[in-house]
Structures are given as C-alpha cells and as structure tokens.
C-alpha cells in the first residue's frame, strides 16, 4: 500500500466574519493508525484547533461521518469566524504512540477573513475657528480585513483633495485600521455645512459607510457691529441701536458704555436666524440728552463665545439738542437717582 498522503486541496479560503469556514482535508490511506489534528500556524508555537483524539472544540465540527473507519475525509468547519481566526491551517496525521508522533502534514490552507470596517468616526478640532482659517478633521475606522480600503472626504457633496490617510499596521495582521486627516478652509457660510468621510471596502458590497461632522460644531463667525442713532422719540430723548449681525454660535453678551462707564449688560436671547445659520440681534438704548451737559460717547461692546470683546462707538452731540430755558432735569434739580438712560433689545 502506498504511503499515506495528506491532501489539502484549497490553498486559500476567504470567509466573511461571523460565517463558518470549511477547511478541506483528505488522507489517502488508513495507515498508520493514529489521530488527525488541525493546527493554525507551523512550528513549535502552532495552535491546536482540533484533535480527533481528545479535547473540547466547541466551534469545530467534522464535515463528514467520522464514525466510519473508511472515512478519509477530515475536513472541519469552524463556526463564527472572526478576524483573529485568520492564518494558515494545517491538517496533520499522527502515528499512534507514546507520545503520538507527527507522520505527515498537509500543505496548509490560508484562511483570510473578510471583516467590515466599523462606522467611520469623524472628529473636528477641539476649539472653534473663524472663517478663512484652515481646520483639520480626522476620520477613523477599525477592524476591517482585507487591508485594501478606499477613503474619501466631502464637504457638502464636494470631494476634498487635501487629506492624508494611513492604514495600520503596515505588515500582515488579522485586521486593520484606517486614519485620515483632512484640511478644510472655513467660510462664513459654513454653519450649515457638513464634512463627510466615506469608506469603501469589499465587504460593503458597494454601499460605503459614512461618518459626518457638522461644521456648526467647529466654526465661529464673529459678529459685525453697527451703532446708529434713531430719530428722537421726545425732544430730549435719543434712541441709539446696536445691530449685531451674522454671528455664530448664539452665545453673546452685550454691554453699553456711556463715556466708558458701564450702563447696561444683557445676553442675546431673542435672536433672528439668517438663512446661512448665523444670527442677528439688536439692542437699543434710550438716552435722555437733557441729563448731559457735554457730548456723550456711547459704546456697544460685544463679547462673543468667550472671545475678546469687540466694540463700536457712537458720539452723541449734546449741543445739537438745546435745553429749554430753565428746564433742568429732575436729576439736576433734585439730585435723585432717576436713570437718564433707558434701554432695550430686539
């Protein structure tokens, strides 16, 4: 009788994670007597996957009827495959003895595991940035196999080109991770913009995974200020408004200064939203001109989103509003605490 051969017909087998892998092995002879064992890897560190003789291998089942001696098929099925199962599997015939001795090994079957990438996670900068600045976004996805993968960046549907991508590790591994950094130039219109990271992989059957970041989390649009004097409401009153325009996010505090002294502080509440996602707000101040002998410098000072304050001033000419003969303000007459500046917002 010819010497036993161990035949592993498949050089490689590719299986999707979660599925079962069938590894084929047949022997050409019934002798010598002794068990078949399956190993992953070769050499002294090889890992026992299945032993016909003994042991508990809950994920492994024999494919054919193993209770008949004439059975020479020692193929196995490994259930619930994960990327960690990737490797070369060897079917090995042992000769019965004390100890059992390796008689002959098959050529090996390389098992590769197709594992889907995790949903891409896009993260932006830790601090907000203003228009015209360039910010970096990162995209990460893990656990995929094989290594080949495609990553694209988009801003509002337009593909970006300024990005760098790495797939790790560089060498052989059971699974891989991708890390990409894209540079995006912010514009004032980006409050409603989205940055999208798109990952395509063989396991996704043409339906790529996407991760998104809203630029509203990243952008800060500083306000423009305009202080205007409205027509007088009464002969001795002037209405001064501070228009705070095109700002984002909404967090804003406004302080009125009269000749450098704080007159009133308020927080933006009833704002109006522009189409581009920025906000407008208006604050007004009613100034009793008759309370002032000299010109008044009114300053609208805005602190937006914790940034250094910006301000706009308006000079109110008192001389332009002559007082009536003998009609001094109550404050001047009585020295009372009655306020001479009134304000509001809208």
């Amino acid at each position: 009788e010819e010497e036993l051969q161990v035949i592993q017909p498949d050089k490689s087998v590719s299986v999707a994670a979660g599925e079962s892998a069938i590894l084929h092995c047949t022997v050409t002879s019934l002798i010598p007597v002794g068990p078949i064992q399956w190993f992953r890897g070769a050499g002294p560190a090889r890992e026992l996957i299945y032993n016909q003789k003994e042991g508990h291998f809950p994920r492994v089942t024999t494919v054919s009827e193993s209770t008949k001696r004439e059975n020479m098929d020692f193929s196995i099925s490994i259930s619930n495959i994960t990327p960690a199962d990737a490797g070369t599997y060897y079917c090995v015939k042992f000769r019965k003895g004390s100890p059992d001795t390796e008689f002959k090994s098959g050529a090996g079957t390389e098992l590769s595991v197709r594992a889907k990438p995790s949903a891409p996670v896009v993260s932006g900068p830790a601090a907000r940035a203003t228009p015209q600045h360039t910010v970096s976004f990162t995209c990460e996805s893990h656990g995929f196999s094989p290594r080949d993968i495609t990553l694209k960046w988009f801003k509002n549907g337009n593909e970006l080109s300024d990005f760098q991508t790495n797939v790790d590790p560089v060498g052989e591994s059971v699974s891989y991770s991708i890390h990409s950094t894209a540079k995006v130039v912010l514009t004032r219109e980006d409050v409603h913009s989205q940055v999208i990271c798109e990952v395509a992989h063989v396991t996704l059957q043409g339906d790529p995974l996407r991760g998104t970041a809203n630029l509203s989390e990243t952008i800060r649009v500083p306000p423009t200020l305009e202080v205007t004097q409205q027509p007088v409401r009464a002969e001795n009153q002037v209405n001064v408004t501070c228009q705070v325009r095109k700002f984002y996010p909404q967090r804003l505090q406004l302080t009125w200064l009269e000749n450098g002294n704080v007159s009133r502080t308020e927080t933006a509440s009833t704002v109006t939203e522009n189409k581009d996602g920025t906000y407008n707000w208006m604050s007004w101040l009613l100034v009793n001109v008759s309370a002032h002998r000299d010109d008044v410098k009114l300053t609208c000072q805005v602190e937006h989103d914790g940034q250094p304050a910006v301000s706009k001033s308006h000079d109110l000419k008192v001389s332009a509003h002559p007082k009536e003969q003998g009609s001094n303000t109550a404050a001047e007459n009585t020295g009372s605490n009655e306020r001479n500046i009134y304000g509001g917002s809208g």
Partner: antibody
C-alpha cells in the same frame, strides 16, 4: 446493525488444529483493524492477534508460529487458523473490531469456545 | 511487553456508592487506555477509550481519567446492573495487554 458472529469452536486434541471464523455485518471489515481476544475459564482477557487494513499481522508471543490471522474481503469475514493446539489455548475466543482511528476495541462478538483436551 | 496492573482485584460496594478502580501501566502509554465491563457468561462491553472518552451508548455515570501511566475508572452511583468485572487495557503498541480485572460485588 454492526455485528460480529464467531463460529468454528469446539473440542480438539492437543496438537490438533481448528479454524475460527468471524462474520461481520453492518460495516466493511477490510476498513478496520480486526482482533482476536481470548479468555480462559475463570481467567482474565488476553489479546491474541490482529490484522491491519494493509494486511499486516500481529501475534502475542505464546501463539506466534502456531496461529495465523487472515481475512476474506469478499465474505466480509475474519479467520484465525490455530495449529499445534495446547491445553493452555483452551478459552472463549472473541472477534473484536478496532476503533475508527485509534484501534480502540469497540465491537465484540459473542465468542466461541475452544477446548483443547485429550 | 507493557504490563497493566489493576487494583483492587475485588471490591465490595453498595447501590448508590461511588467507586474508583485504578490501573497502572509499566511504561507510558499516552492516553491509549480503555476500560471494559464483563458480566458472567457474556462478552465484554467497551466502556471507555483514550482514557476518558465514552463509547456510544455508555451512560455518563462512567468516567475515566489519566494519562501516561496512571488511569482510573469511576462509577458515580452504583446500580444493580453495574456489578460485574472491569478490565483496563493498553492499546498503544502490540501486543495489546489487559489488566487482571477487578470484580465489583454487592456488599
């Protein structure tokens, strides 16, 4: 059903011969290592002989040169030719099938009695 | 030849008892040890192979253990039908050899 049935036992004089047969059913005998085991009256079990799937044969020391194990695939049968019989060969002879991969005994026949006496 | 020494040669026990029979090989036999049960006038019945694997149809009250030279057969809860003679065997190399047997009797 997997079964082994021995036959051919009986009374024989010392120096005489006997041929035991074992008919197998429910499996292909040639695919298994097959054995003969005996048990002298009131004694324990003693392995006697074996034949491998390649026709290789093995014997316990006390029967070497006197007993011959063989099989006939067409009849799915195992045989033990016993020559130069001695009183010490008196025993029940069992035909036994070796296991699928390790030759562990799994199926036993009911046995046939061989008595060597003058 | 490899000798198989079984102990005890006889054992008295009661129904419900847990009993253990041991077998020692004169040299290492890996785990190629088998156990058989034989009742008077009957052919032996295969119980255990490769030291701890149960043959098909053998109740789980029978268990085996060991490797190398020392092996045990344990019957967890004796029933009347378990009173018989038990043999160990090595089948790592020819000539295959049996222990002398342990006769398990009702106390």
């Amino acid at each position: 059903e997997v079964q082994l049935v021995e036959s051919g036992g009986g009374l024989v004089q010392p120096g005489g011969s006997l041929r035991l047969s074992c008919a197998a059913s429910g499996f292909t005998l040639s695919s298994y290592d097959m054995h003969w085991v005996r048990q002298a009256p009131g004694k324990g079990l003693e392995w006697v002989s074996a034949i491998g799937t390649a026709g290789d044969t093995y014997y316990t020391g006390s029967v070497k040169g006197r007993f011959t194990i063989s099989r006939e695939n067409a009849k799915n049968s195992l045989y033990l030719q016993m020559n130069s019989l001695r009183a010490s060969d008196t025993a029940v002879y069992y035909c036994v099938r070796g296991g699928v991969w390790d030759d562990a005994f799994d199926i036993w026949g009911q046995g046939t009695m061989v008595t060597v006496s003058s | 030849d490899i000798q198989m020494t079984q102990s005890p040669s006889s054992l008295s026990a009661s129904v419900g008892d847990r009993v253990t029979i041991t077998c020692r090989a004169s040299q290492g036999i890996n785990n190629y040890a088998a156990w058989f049960q034989q009742k008077p006038g009957k052919a032996p019945k295969s119980l255990i192979y490769t030291a701890s694997s149960l043959h098909s149809g053998v109740p789980s009250k029978f268990s085996g253990s060991g490797s190398g030279t020392d092996f045990t057969l344990t019957i967890s809860s004796l029933q009347p039908e378990d009173f018989a003679t038990y043999y160990c065997q090595q089948y790592v190399s020819y000539p295959y050899t049996f222990g002398q047997g342990t006769k398990l009797e009702i106390k």
